[in-house]
Interface confidence: low
Amino acid sequence: GITIPRNPGCPNSEDKNFPRTVMVNLNIHNRNTNTNPKRSSDYYNRSTSPWNLHRNEDPERYPSVIWEAKCRHLGCINADGNVDYHMNSVPIQQEILVLRREPPHCPNSFRLEKILVSVGCTCVTPIVHHVA
Amino acid sequence: GITIPRNPGCPNSEDKNFPRTVMVNLNIHNRNTNTNPKRSSDYYNRSTSPWNLHRNEDPERYPSVIWEAKCRHLGCINADGNVDYHMNSVPIQQEILVLRREPPHCPNSFRLEKILVSVGCTCVTPIVHHVA
């Protein structure tokens, strides 16, 4: 990998070993402006594999609100507007990082956690394995 | 919101004001096992709105590697395997949290950052604006 010289102005690290604790500034630098997934696009309604967005709230997690996509149909919407079960609507999942309060209920102490969230749905052709 | 009593065993907070600095344990609790998006499913190839996955690497960011989806076609794949331009392949985007080294090149000091990533693609009916 790339070796980058350490900045001499870095804060001291209390613990150089893993599991390591680091300082994180929660004043988020947001490169985006829109946070409501329903406002950001109407793809969830216009897709051939449409989905609903469900609000998942957990006060022990940062961010406390995450939106989860649930595909509306087993199949996909065809040109006639009907559900075609020859195709499958499937969730597109992504691993994201969240902060989990640890110990619980502490405002200033967290552990990084990876969780799997469904972001939206896509329409796929099913695979059939022909067993000899 | 829900008011949760503070745990008396919490570490002391140096700064109670925003922008606030918190302690984060980087020993990730991973609820999932598969991190390579190409292994987790082959939806990117089987979708009617297929996409390619591009590796985005940034040593100043945690996680340093993020996979970005780029839709292969403007249109969607129809039942005959051809691209149908009456439909559109569009990226499904999600805001995710990452840690950005701040000051730069510091191993133990970060700022939370929100970035927008494309996770996959879905096929949508285009919106046609009829101009009077």
Partner: antibody, heavy 125, light 107 residues
């Protein structure tokens, strides 16, 4: 080997309720859509309901909509059918059915390769 | 709802006979047509899926064909254990529907 074992059938009066269970083993239960299919005495097969692997989506035949609820507990590898406001025409053997293991439409398998032995529901006064 | 009509409703045949059962849908079900065998007091058994694919362990005397709205199940040489009721199933559109069944009896 895939095994499906239904239970919970019996005699119930019209307007009554019954909850059927199906214990599944031998396959990754939470991955697959599951279904209930019924067969009235001396009659043909009739699909009743389907539930997705995650439990997020359910599908019913019109005659049972609003009366029957299909659900699942993936931690217990169990499928359920809660039947309320039962009618004489609901009298049937109820089968729990699961999809084939070789079909990789991912979370959905759209036909039934494995069936339980069935449980008889009799609605009569 | 998609209606499936099987014909004949019943048939009498002898061991060794070639038997064909047809299933007609009132609208296209593409390739999502499947065939089951059921014996008295038993659960149905999958024979053929997706029109023409034989389920594992099913004897090769059973075959399926057809497309769109017209489908056929053929038993090339009827065996004593084949006397049963046969059903077609479409899973193209909810509600999933079965044909009314074809009873194959010994002549």
């Amino acid at each position: 080997e895939v095994q499906l074992v239904e239970s919970g059938g019996g005699l119930v009066q019209p307007g009554g309720s019954l909850r059927l269970s199906c214990a599944a083993s031998g396959f990754p239960f939470s991955t697959y859509a599951m279904a209930w299919v019924r067969q009235a005495p001396g009659k043909g097969l009739e699909w009743v309901a389907t539930i997705r692997g995650s439990g997020e989506s359910t599908y019913y035949r019109d005659s049972v909509k609003g009366r029957f609820t299909i659900s699942r507990d993936n931690a217990k590898n169990s499928l359920y059918l809660q039947m309320n406001s039962l009618r004489a025409e609901d009298t049937a053997v109820y089968y729990c059915a699961s999809p084939p293991q070789y079909y990789e439409g991912s979370i959905d398998r759209l036909w039934f390769a494995h069936w339980g032995q069935g449980t008889l529901v009799t609605v009569s006064s | 709802d998609i209606q499936l009509t099987q014909s004949p409703s019943s048939l009498s045949a002898s061991v060794g006979d070639r038997v064909t059962i047809t299933c007609r849908a009132d609208e296209s079900v593409r390739t999502l047509m499947h065939w089951y065998q059921q014996k008295p007091g038993k659960a149905p058994k999958l024979l053929i899926y997706l029109v023409s694919n034989s389920e594992i362990g099913v004897p090769d005397r059973f075959s399926g064909s057809g497309s769109g709205t017209d489908f056929r199940l053929t038993i090339s040489s009827l065996q004593p254990e084949d006397f049963a009721t046969y059903y077609c199933l479409q899973t193209y559109s909810y509600p999933f529907t079965f044909g009314q069944g074809t009873k194959v009896e010994i002549k």
